[in-house]
């Protein structure tokens, strides 16, 4: 299963059915701290720190759409979110040239298991209801990511994913200089 198959919006089920939004911005004060209950107990990894949070399942309940048609009932979906912390990158610098090098393998919070659910879609204008089978995320895991997964495969994981490798400068042209700098500053 290629990394491209995993999407943070966790829909990737039926082309045309409405997609889920990205998880809301994470706030250090309101996040689900491990000592405050954390996430459901089946999660494999628990990261606890002022800045590193664990891979967890966010629940979204919303209607699915397919063109003008909409699901008769809202569907509860899981979205995998969070870090498989702690940070495994260290700053390196020679003169004014900065890059990141790893101090451990990179893991990503991605879907682990899926479940199938049949959804009835109601269409306007008296059209007959449609029935569709959708594939929904059932659980998440911290999965190893390697530098050999190319940039296009990484794009669904957000800006912090495409990091320079050990002992290498950021690839020229991969992102703007400002974007690269922001990435370095926010990587932890």
């Amino acid at each position: 299963q290629g990394w491209q198959a995993f999407r943070n919006d966790a829909t990737e089920v039926i082309p045309g059915l409405g997609e889920y939004p990205e998880p809301p911005p994470e706030n250090n004060q309101t996040m689900n701290r491990a000592e405050n209950g954390g996430r459901p107990p089946h999660h494999p990894y628990d990261a606890k720190d002022v800045s590193e949070y664990s891979c967890r399942e966010l629940h979204y309940t919303r209607f699915l759409t397919d063109g003008p048609c909409r699901s008769a009932k809202p569907v509860t979906e899981l979205v995998c979110s969070g870090q498989c912390g702690p940070a495994r990158l260290l700053p390196n610098a020679i003169g004014r040239v900065k890059w990141w090098r790893p101090n451990g393998p990179d893991f990503r919070c991605i879907p682990d298991r899926y479940r199938a659910q049949r959804v009835q879609l109601l269409c306007p204008g008296g059209a007959a209801p449609r029935s569709r089978k959708v594939r929904l995320v059932a659980s998440c895991k911290c999965k190893r990511l390697t530098r050999f997964h190319n940039q296009s495969e990484l794009k669904d994981f957000g800006p912090e994913t495409a990091r320079p490798q050990k002992g290498r400068k950021p690839r020229p042209g991969a992102r703007g200089a400002k974007a690269n700098q922001a990435e370095l500053e926010n990587a932890y």
């Epitope: 494999p44 720190d49 800045s51 702690p86 260290l90 101090n103 451990g104 390697t146 490798q165 932890y188």
Partner: antibody, heavy 123, light 107 residues
Framework: EVQLVQSGAEVKKPGASVKVSCKAS????????MHWVRQAPGQGLEWMGE????????GYNQKFKGRVTMTTDTSTSTAYMELRSLRSDDTAVYYC????????????????WGQGTTVTVSS | DIQMTQSPSSLSASVGDRVTITCRAS??????LNWYQQKPGKAPKLLIY???RLLSGVPSRFSGSGSGTDFTLTISSLQPEDFATYYC?????????FGGGTKVEIK
């Protein structure tokens, strides 16, 4: 030579806590996360978690959630693992370990291990 | 968690024998499989990483193969110092997990 030297054996009563130390030498301590692995008598190896000495951020195996705390002291290049609410099945040898890296294969492995600290939990 | 199942759990062999230990993962772990050797009272020592890469200094009689879920450690000609317990470990998904071990004893 890269070395990890751990504290001595401990005997604890059920419900107590234990804090094991691991002093690193021969490399820059903050360059690698420190991992902890335990081994119950006659049993296999069990990964407990890791800590980043730079940020102090730690990640724990869910099995130990709420009972384990990993910390580091960068001034002495020492990592600590505290396990609370000890039970008899926590009787084990506790190892600290550091990863090694192969740049060609982009792969990591437990390369350097401490000598182990025996923790016995008995009433 | 990914379960790592080693077989056999123990075996008896003689010096010079060819020994094969298998490790099966409960799900695909690509090539993120390491092998360790442990002797009584000692910490584990890495032998092979990334399924088949021999750590520098490890004798060439040790070899590893496999991919996905099924992996093998082979000792082509068992030496007296090879009598020990061998563990596989996956590095694909957190938490890292180890096999239950295979004890290689003298026949």
């Amino acid at each position: 030579e890269v070395q990890l030297v751990q504290s001595g054996a401990e005997v604890k009563k059920p419900g107590a806590s234990v804090k094991v130390s691991c002093k690193a030498s021969g490399y820059t301590f903050t360059d690698y996360n420190m991992h902890w692995v335990r081994q119950a008598p006659g049993q296999g190896l069990e990964w407990m978690g890791e800590i980043n000495p730079n940020s102090g951020g730690a990640g724990y195996n869910q099995k130990f959630k709420g009972r384990v705390t990993m910390t580091t002291d960068t001034s002495t290049s020492t990592a600590y693992m505290e396990l609370r609410s000890l039970r008899s099945d926590d009787t084990a040898v506790y190892y600290c370990a550091r990863l090694g890296y192969d740049d060609i294969y982009d792969d990591w492995y437990f390369h350097v291990w401490g000598q182990g600290t025996t923790v016995t939990v008995s009433s | 968690d990914i379960q790592m199942t080693q077989s056999p759990s123990s075996l008896s062999a003689s010096v010079g024998d060819r020994v094969t230990i298998t490790c099966r993962a409960s799900q695909d772990i690509s090539n993120y499989l390491n092998w360790y050797q442990q002797k009584p009272g000692k910490a584990p020592k890495l032998l092979i990483y990334h399924t088949s890469r021999l750590l520098s200094g490890v004798p060439s009689r040790f070899s590893g193969s496999g991919s996905g879920t099924d992996f093998t450690l082979t000792i082509s000609s068992l030496q007296p110092e090879d009598f020990a317990t061998y563990y596989c470990q996956q590095g694909d998904t957190l938490p890292y997990t180890f096999g239950g071990g295979t004890k290689v004893e003298i026949k």
